[in-house]
């Protein structure tokens, strides 16, 4: 029975005399008067078996002690660690000439674990062992002896096992412990590659090349290799593995990404939190699922937020000129979280009697600059038929519109070609200006050309230069424009609409809001 003792991870013990419980029972020759087995205690009061010999008074000593058979376990080189005490001959009276201060270590390779008789000549000598510290009379007087430790190695070995032998030639020795071990490079993980327990090579300078295998949930980037050195240390790691998509490195392992995290590719990156408007419900996600109503375009990276189609364009304005129509609009309030917004124009030709009976306009109609994929917020439509009702739809689209097309993404206007629109309004007046509002009034156009259905007021901050305008519609010839900013210059245009369409906008009226209320009568010129 062998008790367990702790040794370095790169050493595999084949024999440890200190761990043997009960007698070692090694073979001594001669049987009497030579090596003697002695039981002593270790520091934990556990018995350990030792061998001692001290025939220093008699000449020509040749005392042999042979171990049991020791399996090699595939090792080509083994190490023998001997802890022993050795008396200094000078400390022993009357032994000059007969006392020695060394002993010899031998080995014999064998496939037979039960060899009874091995001739001395069959053993190969490993070394002569001398003490670093021999024990003088002073040591004896102190009654506490230091232990010598000597390590020798032997190899290459080829048979299944071997026997060790200790030859005493007249010394006073106690073998306190004998440990036989071989060295291995212990199982390890480097760069996410696992390298197995590897027995060191036969020579003290040899390197054993070992190919590693990627840990679970990882894949080779470059072929992982290492070299097992003779001392049981791994050397020169080459190549590596990378955690698969959906996994990240943690303590030398590839762990699945937690819920709410993802990793799209086999890289050395960590899992990332799901981008905005997306989620993962399983561990090990390689991408995150978009929230309801949100989408990811084909060319969107997994790291991009999920987005949605834009809302409808705002403030669509039409201007009919015989068989041409100019359309103008503002950007949608909500772009869906994307930059790739563009506009498509849909033209429908509708029957005069039943506006619901509409057909596509066909290829004869031309669009400037283009019909689809417009980056600007205006288009001119030409080559329309005269005296015809047209409905124009402006669709705001982005990279994910195709996943969820909806009428909510378009705005439409209906016009009739070839009817004269009203003339422009000659006079627009600012009746009252406050800090936050302007009261406007105007006259009917000189040439209404029909029944005025409504007036349209377009206004914007002067320094915005018509980039961002607002529209107010009214059937009356006056209106209060509210929600303005104090001390700000605004530009106002007004036009009339009849069944034939919109007339031209009036000349601009520039008004600056006040810091204190006052009445200002406009005369069509700039007011301040």
């Amino acid at each position: 029975v062998t008790g367990s003792r702790v040794y370095p991870a790169n050493e595999v013990t084949l024999l440890d005399s200190r761990s043997v419980q009960g007698e070692l029972g090694w073979i001594a020759s001669p049987l009497e008067g030579g090596w003697e087995e002695v039981s002593i205690m270790d520091e934990k009061n556990t018995p350990i078996r030792t061998y001692q010999v001290c025939n220093v008074m008699e000449a020509s000593q040749n005392n042999w002690l042979r171990t049991d058979w020791i399996t090699r376990e595939g090792a080509q080189r083994v190490y023998i660690e001997i802890k022993f005490t050795l008396r200094d001959c000078n400390s022993l009276p009357g032994v000059m000439g007969t006392c020695k201060e060394t002993f010899n270590l031998y080995y014999y390779e064998s496939d037979n674990d039960k060899e009874r008789f091995i001739r001395e000549s069959q053993f190969g000598k490993i070394d002569t062992i001398a003490a670093d510290e021999s024990f003088t009379q002073v040591d004896i007087g102190d009654r506490i002896m230091k232990l010598n430790t000597e390590i020798r190695d032997v190899g290459p070995l080829s048979k299944k096992g071997f026997y060790l032998a200790f030859q005493d030639v007249g010394a006073c020795i106690a073998l306190v412990s004998v440990r036989v071990f071989y060295k291995k490079c212990p199982l390890t993980v480097r760069n996410l590659a696992q390298f197995p327990d590897t027995i060191t090579g036969a020579d003290t300078s040899s390197l054993v090349e070992v190919r590693g295998s990627c840990v679970n949930n990882s894949e080779e980037k470059d072929v992982p290799k290492m070299y097992c050195g003779a001392d049981g240390e791994w050397l020169v790691p080459i190549g590596n593995c990378l955690c698969n998509a959906g996994h990240e490195e943690q303590n030398g392992e590839c762990q699945a990404c937690k819920i709410g995290y993802y990793k799209a590719l086999s890289t050395d990156a960590s899992c990332a939190k799901c981008p905005p408007h997306s989620y993962s419900v399983w561990e090990g996600a390689t991408s995150c699922t978009c929230d309801r109503g949100f989408f990811r375009a084909d060319n969107d990276a997994a790291s991009m937020p999920c987005t949605r189609p834009p809302s409808a364009p705002l403030n669509l304005i039409s201007n009919v000129n015989e068989t041409s129509v100019n359309l103008e609009w503002s950007s949608p309030q909500n772009t869906g979280g994307r930059q790739d917004i563009s506009y498509n124009v849909v033209c429908k030709k509708c029957g005069a009697g039943d506006p619901s009976k509409c057909r596509p306009c066909g290829s004869g109609v031309h669009y400037t600059p283009q019909q689809n994929g417009l980056k600007t917020t205006r288009v001119s439509i030409t080559d329309l038929l005269a005296h015809t009702n047209y409905t124009f739809e402006i669709w705001a689209v982005n990279g994910v519109s195709k996943y969820n097309p909806s009428p909510d993404q378009s705005v439409s206007v209906t016009v009739t070609t070839n009817q004269a629109a009203p003339s422009s309004i000659a006079l627009v007046q600012a009746k009252e200006v406050t800090r936050y509002s302007v009261a406007l009034a105007w006259l009917e156009p000189d040439r209404p050309n029909g029944v005025i259905l409504e007036y349209e007021v377009k206004y914007y901050e002067k320094d915005q230069n018509e980039r961002s305008y607002r529209i107010v519609r009214t059937a009356a010839r006056n209106t209060d424009i509210k929600g303005l900013n104090p001390l700000t210059s605004y530009v106002f245009h007004v036009r009339a609409r009849t069944a034939a369409g919109y007339g031209d906008f009036s000349e601009p009226l520039e008004v600056t809001t006040n810091t204190v209320p006052s009445r200002i009568i406009g005369d069509g010129a700039n007011s301040t």
């Epitope: 003697e36 087995e37 002695v38 039981s39 002593i40 205690m41 270790d42 520091e43 009061n45 350990i48 030792t50 001692q52 001290c54 220093v56 802890k83 005490t85 008396r87 022993l92 024990f135 004896i140 007087g141 102190d142 009654r143 506490i144 002896m145 230091k146 232990l147 006073c172 106690a174 306190v176 412990s177």
Partner: antibody, heavy 126, light 112 residues
Framework: EVQLVQSGAEVKKPGSSVKVSCKAS????????ISWVRQAPGQGLEWMGG????????NYAQKFQGRVTMTRDTSISTAYMELSRLRSDDTAVYYC???????????????????WGQGTMVTVSS | DVVMTQSPLSLPVTPGEPASISCRSS???????????LDWYLQKPGQSPQLLIY???NRASGVPDRFSGSGSGTDFTLKISRVEAEDVGVYYC?????????FGGGTKVEIK
């Protein structure tokens, strides 16, 4: 249970020698040290010397050097102490005592006299 | 040689009460291996001595836990937490670091 059994009382003339034996029963005799301690009537304890197997030879107190010889015969598990040139002040009870040997990873030593013989009275008188 | 000095020479005790014996050495008994090489023995009337404590503070096998040893270097103490009638006798300390081994002069413990 190890016991140390000593030889019987002795009466000796001054100048003569006495040899006291100490036989161990139980245990492995070679596995422990044997020391000899004496106690003069009404006095304290006095260490004379001993044999520690892994030290190789006997070790004697300077006071008894040249007069005392300690030996052991492992075949019969017996230790001996011989004191020569006896004087009247050698009158004492002579004890043999066992010391357990121990070794740590760096040194070896002993763990006290854990078993004692019953004592042998040696009287030196003319 | 190392000289061992014990005190007191005599210690009258009451059963159930604690008792303490001091031992001083002329040289340190602390070895470089960390052990103090000091033992305590009790010799009951008409008997051979028996080991109580070895290496300064380790109780020998079968010794009741009311006995404890302490100290390091040159000053050591044996304590009996609650003296019992069977504890009477002469207590000796002994240095086991160097030869010659040396015993203290002894402390006689007796019931009041």
């Amino acid at each position: 249970e190890v016991q140390l059994v000593q030889s019987g009382a002795e009466v000796k003339k001054p100048g003569s020698s006495v040899k006291v034996s100490c036989k161990a029963s139980g245990g492995t005799f070679s596995s422990y040290a044997i020391s000899w301690v004496r106690q003069a009537p009404g006095q304290g304890l006095e260490w004379m010397g001993g044999i520690i197997p892994i030290f190789g030879t006997a070790n004697y107190a300077q006071k008894f050097q040249g007069r005392v010889t300690m030996t052991r015969d492992t075949s019969i598990s017996t230790a001996y102490m011989e004191l020569s040139r006896l004087r009247s002040d050698d009158t004492a009870v002579y004890y043999c005592a066992r010391e357990l040997l121990y070794c740590s990873s760096t040194s070896c030593g002993t763990h006290g006299f854990d078993i004692w013989g019953q004592g042998t009275m040696v009287t030196v008188s003319s | 040689d190392v000289v061992m000095t014990q005190s007191p020479l005599s210690l009258p005790v009451t059963p159930g009460e604690p008792a303490s014996i001091s031992c001083r050495s002329s040289q340190s008994l602390l070895h470089s291996n960390g052990y103090n090489y000091l033992d305590w023995y009790l010799q009951k009337p008409g008997q051979s001595p028996q080991l109580l404590i070895y290496l300064g503070s380790n109780r020998a096998s079968g010794v009741p836990d009311r006995f404890s040893g302490s100290g390091s270097g040159t000053d050591f103490t044996l304590k009996i937490s609650r003296v019992e009638a069977e504890d009477v006798g002469v207590y000796y300390c002994m240095q086991a670091l160097q030869t010659p081994l040396a015993f203290g002069g002894g402390t006689k413990v007796e019931i009041k």
